[in-house]
């Protein structure tokens, strides 16, 4: 049994890091493998992650972490029974993938303005809380070419757009994702999408 593709990990910089790797053949990850991880810190304790299958030869493990900060560094040991298959390390702050925003809502009752709001996925005491920026994707269910991205570079989790910038009388969907420049993160996954019917009164022409 050998590791074909070494584990790569990303952290949500809050409580979970996800590691993925590939074995050289079909593997029952949860029965055959264990990923041991330990913070390189005084008094830290070793933890064991039981991986799940991710395709035939792929495995994924969700590592639970407390109080993640930029100084943290973890040792990782991948075991198959008594055999050490791979040894490495992981610094969560250098591989951050933010959590996806939630509770995306479209408010259509504001005079000819669409107000989109969503929730910041981090608590106020987490460093990323004040450092997320967002991308909002709006697209038409009827017209695949009607697809747009709005970059929200301010901290407030909301976006206002004129309803007239979208076609009237058709349904649209929106979703939002986040990233943080401070840690050079990847983009989060998209939030679940939300749907609304765009209707506004065309201005009366003389």
């Amino acid at each position: 049994m050998k590791v074909l593709q070494e584990p790569t990990c990303v952290s949500d910089y809050m409580s979970i890091s996800t590691c993925e790797w590939k074995m050289n053949g079909p593997t029952n990850c949860s029965t055959e493998l264990r990923l041991l991880y330990q913070l390189v810190f005084l008094l830290s304790e070793a933890h064991t992650c039981i991986p799940e299958n991710n395709g035939g030869a792929g495995c994924v493990c969700h590592l639970l972490m407390d109080d993640v900060v930029s100084a943290d560094n973890y040792t990782l040991d991948l075991w198959a029974g008594q055999q050490l298959l791979w040894k490495g390390s992981f610094k969560p702050s250098e591989h951050v993938k933010p959590r996806a925003p939630g509770n995306l809502t479209v408010h259509t009752n504001v005079s000819d303005t669409l107000l989109l709001t969503w929730s910041n996925p981090y608590p106020p005491d987490n460093y990323l809380y004040n450092h997320l920026t967002y991308a909002v994707n709006i697209w038409s269910e009827n017209d695949p070419a009607d697809f747009r991205i709005y970059n929200v570079t301010y901290l407030e989790p909301s976006l206002r757009i004129a309803a007239s910038t979208l076609k009237s009388g058709i349904s649209y969907r929106a979703r939002v994702r986040a990233w943080a420049q401070c840690y050079n993160t990847t983009w989060s996954e998209w939030s679940p999408s939300t749907k609304w019917h765009n209707s506004y009164r065309e201005p009366f022409e003389q």
Partner: antibody, heavy 116, light 111 residues
Framework: QVQLVQSGAEVKKPGASVKVSCKAS????????MHWARQAPGQGLEWMGI????????SYAQKFQGRVTMTRDTSTSTVYMELSSLRSEDTAVYYC?????????WGKGTLVTVSS | QSVLTQPPSVSAAPGQKVTISCSGG????????VSWYQQLPGTAPKLLIY???KRPSGIPDRFSGSKSGTSATLAITGLQTGDEADYYC????????????FGTGTKLTVL
Amino acid sequence: QVQLVQSGAEVKKPGASVKVSCKASGYAFTSYYMHWARQAPGQGLEWMGIINPSGGSTSYAQKFQGRVTMTRDTSTSTVYMELSSLRSEDTAVYYCARGKYWMYDWGKGTLVTVSS
Amino acid sequence: QSVLTQPPSVSAAPGQKVTISCSGGSSNIGNSYVSWYQQLPGTAPKLLIYDNNKRPSGIPDRFSGSKSGTSATLAITGLQTGDEADYYCGTWDTSTVWEWPFGTGTKLTVL
């Protein structure tokens, strides 16, 4: 919000021991390390040691080795710092502080006076 | 005896900028991250800066931190009378056993 509530002031005689408590609330108690530091009157801060509330393991500053004991009670989310063989130089305000590499939150402090 | 050295006192007028230095060594500041604490008279210390330069929520951006080699600096701009306090740097040292030294402390007086 996070709160670290410390026990009240103590007056002790030289040679005695003192046990200071620090009750934590507003966060997952076993997820954060706890430090103890002290400050003698008119002096600076001095680190004493650290405890991992999850397993109860401890590490102490070399200066206090053999005299200090840190424990925790997960059922009440409380950590304790006991200092023995007290001398007049141990007169200080003793603080508990939550954190790992740095101290996010501090208790208000407990004044321990050692006097004959 | 602290292994982190700070000036005993600094002073400046309201609205001015002041800096406080913290000098250490390769086994502490040089190999770790620096935090700064503010201690107002008669109160417990409060975290001001961590990770060399990050502010906890609620700390105004008038406070900033930096690190270079084995030294660190706290800068306070737009000084206010309420900033009058003792300031301590902190880090961790892994030279023999892990320890968390604090700086000697700096008394800031707002003139």
